[in-house]
């Protein structure tokens, strides 16, 4: 693994893709989504230690300034680098439709 | 202001653009950047309460699941929505060059 992919905090502690099982009720969608009633939500969770999956130079700067001024500048944060599309079957004015959402499920993660 | 831009925690507490004054030493760039010696680093800092500057549907999901499972799912986090380019004058093998960096300074912020 590249240095930027090896977690210094121990396996699974750093920024990575997690799957969270959620019902439509959990998501607040129960009144407009028909199916599926359970969704496997992929999201980015974990710590962003120095040099770990840094998205860009801004993330490097942020980490350096966080070290100097931890009360002012937060550490970089684990967010989606890209998304997977997802289909929801939902009620519409005219009936029922299959709707694609492109920004719903994280595909991979990085630190920003 | 749209509802998503009004901070419920009080002025300046929510996710927004901040300017942090930093020297090349602060940034760890002193050995390869000649100028400028001081940089006004714009970065995204602040809390991401519910519905505040949500980047997309993923951010909505994350907030809903954070409310339900705060120990498992973190709240959305304040990150750059876009960047401003910046020019650095730097040392190279052949001398000195002007180099543009597109991902260095945050231009605006949102919650993901």
């Amino acid at each position: 693994a590249r240095n930027g992919d090896r977690c210094p905090l121990g396996p699974g502690r750093c920024c990575r893709l997690h799957t969270v099982h959620a019902s439509l009720e959990d998501l607040g969608w129960a009144d407009w989504v028909l199916s599926p009633r359970e969704v496997q939500v992929t999201m980015c969770i974990g710590a962003c230690p120095s040099q770990f999956r840094e998205a860009n130079m801004h993330a490097q700067i942020k980490m350096n300034l966080h070290r100097l001024k931890p009360d002012t500048v937060p550490a970089p944060c684990c967010v989606p680098a890209s998304y997977n599309p997802m289909v929801l079957i939902q009620k519409t004015d005219t009936g029922v439709s299959l709707q694609t959402y492109d920004d719903l499920l994280a595909k991979d993660c990085h630190c920003v | 202001a749209r509802n998503g831009d009004r901070c419920p925690l009080g002025p300046g507490r929510c996710c927004r653009l901040h300017t942090v004054h930093a020297s090349l030493e602060d940034l760890g760039w002193a050995d390869w950047v000649l100028s400028p010696r001081e940089v006004q680093v714009t970065m995204c800092i602040g809390a991401c309460p519910s519905q505040f500057r949500e980047a997309n549907m993923h951010a909505q999901i994350k907030m809903n699941l954070h409310r339900l499972k705060p120990d498992t799912v973190p709240a959305p986090c304040c990150v750059p929505a876009s960047y401003n380019p910046m020019v650095l004058i730097q040392k190279t093998d052949t001398g000195v060059s002007l180099q543009t960096y597109d991902d260095l300074l945050a231009k605006d912020c949102h919650c993901v």
Epitope: L34, S35, R37, V39, V96, L98, T100 | -
Partner: antibody, heavy 119, light 107 residues
Framework: QVQLVQSGAEVKKPGASVKVSCKAS????????INWVRQAPGQGLEWMGW????????VYAQKLQGRVTMTTDTSTSTAYMELRSLRSDDTAVYYC????????????WGQGTMVTVSS | DIQMTQSPSSVSASVGDRVTITCRAS??????LAWYQQKPGKAPKLLIY???SLQSGVPSRFSGSGSGTDFTLTISSLQPEDFATYYC?????????FGGGTKVEIK
């Protein structure tokens, strides 16, 4: 494991009705929809419609609208497809299939029910 | 309705051959295309979903690619159990529609 088990073969006269059942097991029946797909002898697959067990909402193929009714019984985790005013060209194997899921997948199929329409 | 056009309608191939089947949608369907294998007297079996994701338990010699309107199913090295009919199916919008099928026969 996830399974869909359909009712047995039927022989019907033209003008009659048929009701095919599809019993689900191995997953929460109300979490996903059920499609009905048919296949005439030697032909390809034809989608007939979809129902969600959760609310009973349906979508039917236009050519079958008015002749087909899809229902579910959540107490027995069973889906039903009734086709009325049968014609000889309704002779086919009728399948139930789970989905589409969040990745638009129709992943588990019943074994099929042969319906023969003959005078 | 979205029309799905599969080609070829049949292909003769030998064990070990690489086989490619294409499917074209009459309008863009994002990546919402699935591929099924069907053997005589049996229900269709899901091989590939979301254009390129391999269904659990399906051998890795099957692969899918494409997005928008043009999609491909590839069998990298044909095995005796792969002789069957293959269907593509879109689930981008209702009504869900299938391609006409491609029969893979022994040469």
């Amino acid at each position: 494991q996830v399974q869909l088990v359909q009712s047995g073969a039927e022989v019907k006269k033209p003008g009659a009705s048929v009701k095919v059942s599809c019993k689900a097991s191995g997953y929460t029946f109300t979490d996903e929809g059920i499609n009905w797909v048919r296949q005439a002898p030697g032909q390809g697959l034809e989608w007939m419609g979809w129902i969600t067990a959760y609310s009973g909402d349906t979508v039917y193929a236009q050519k079958l609208q008015g002749r087909v009714t899809m229902t579910t019984d959540t107490s027995t985790s069973t889906a039903y497809m009734e086709l009325r005013s049968l014609r000889s060209d309704d002779t086919a194997v009728y399948y139930c299939a789970r989905g589409p899921g969040q990745y638009a997948d129709v992943d588990v199929w019943g074994q099929g029910t042969m319906v023969t329409v003959s005078s | 309705d979205i029309q799905m056009t599969q080609s070829p309608s049949s292909v003769s191939a030998s064990v070990g051959d690489r086989v490619t089947i294409t499917c074209r949608a009459s309008q863009g369907i994002s990546s919402w295309l699935a591929w099924y294998q069907q053997k005589p007297g049996k229900a269709p079996k899901l091989l590939i979903y979301a254009a390129s994701s391999l269904q659990s338990g399906v051998p890795s010699r099957f692969s899918g690619s494409g997005s928008g309107t043009d999609f491909t199913l590839t069998i990298s090295s044909l095995q005796p159990e792969d002789f069957a009919t293959y269907y593509c199916q879109q689930a981008n919008s209702f009504p869900i529609t299938f391609g006409g099928g491609t029969k893979v026969e022994i040469k």
